[in-house]
Amino acid sequence: APTSSSTKKTQLQLEHLLLDLQMILNGINNYKNPKLTRMLTFKFYMPKKATELKHLQCLEEELKPLEEVLNLAQSKNFHLRPRDLISNINVIVLELKGSETTFMCEYADETATIVEFLNRWITFSQSIISTLT
């Protein structure tokens, strides 16, 4: 059974992941972003089901495509540093999902835009956090 300290650690990691995903979304989903319409031409795979930490495998598999799109989002006054950001997210995801069991991710038939993709994983993080508090 999870201890209160491990639950607290999981909660903190999820909050960190949530903040990173929200930062990315806020940085790109701005109607004045000159590259937004072109960023929306990139497609992301969405999980068929995302209710448990093991389902973060589906997010991990889409981190490389996410980094590629984020490379378009930089500007002189907005430094996302995609490689560092994705690396941080990857570390959190690996810790959260664990490596004991190998989970095969199942994807939905329909692909999504970067905005839909980020919103889906933000909702997932918020949902898991709410069950822990």
Partner: antibody, heavy 121, light 111 residues
């Protein structure tokens, strides 16, 4: 050498369909978006739309929405611009171009040689 | 859509002349410290060729006599010493907002 090679000139009648092509070489085709630009005789340049060859995702200039269809076949590194029913006003030179958008930039760095489309009865 | 007005629309010049072409946008093309304005050269029967991107960056392989400046709504392309191969039509392009738009062009002819 990075290049975009377009299909040859076309002469068509009003109402006919047409599909012109733009083949990329010398670079990873799916890593860059492809844009289409129209230049009517003696006129300036007009942006028509863009395709992501990796995903097939597109975005059109409202002016050309419903008038043309942009597609791509990533297996042969080729993008297409097509019309289902041509009009005389479609007579123009059509260019494809590669979009560069990483970092602080957004511009067309490589252009095809152009495809002349003439529509006349 | 953002309208780009180039001036002059055409003019005659001699080799060695310093040439300045201006492009005025109907609204700012700046975003978070960057100016999304590009310049292209087009010769008759040929495709446009990129010269300057993001207002002032010289494209690789383009001679240093070409330079760009400006921000907000007012931009300039300068050719410090016109060469015979520079006689062509020049277009500005904004890439700050869809639809991307081009200026009407400036034709540089031999005097």
């Amino acid at each position: 050498e990075v290049q975009l090679v377009q299909s040859g000139a076309e002469v068509k009648k009003p109402g006919e369909s047409l599909k012109i092509s733009c083949k990329g070489s010398g670079y990873a085709f799916t890593n860059y978006l492809i844009e289409w630009v129209r230049q009517m005789p003696g006129k300036g340049l007009e942006w028509m739309g863009v395709i992501n060859p990796g995903s097939g995702g597109t975005n059109y200039n409202e002016k050309f929405k419903g008038q043309v269809t942009i597609s791509a076949d990533k297996s042969i590194s080729t993008a297409y611009l097509q019309w289902s029913s041509l009009k005389a006003s479609d007579t123009a030179m059509y260019y494809c171009a590669r979009w560069r958008g990483e970092g602080y930039y957004a511009y067309f760095d490589v252009w095809g040689q152009g495809t002349t489309v003439t529509v006349s009865s | 859509a953002i309208r780009l007005t180039q001036s002059p629309s055409s003019f005659s010049a001699s080799t060695g002349d310093r040439v300045t072409i201006t492009c005025k946008a109907s609204q700012s093309v700046d975003y978070q410290g960057d100016s999304y304005m590009n310049w292209y050269q087009q010769k008759p029967g040929k495709a446009p060729k990129l010269l300057i991107y993001t207002a002032s960056n010289l494209e690789s392989g383009v001679p240093s006599r070409f330079s760009g400046s400006g921000s907000g709504t007012d931009f300039t392309l300068t050719i410090s010493s016109l060469q015979s191969e520079d006689f062509a039509t020049y277009y500005c392009q904004q890439s700050n907002e869809d639809p991307y738009t081009f200026g009407g062009g400036t034709k540089v002819e031999i005097k």
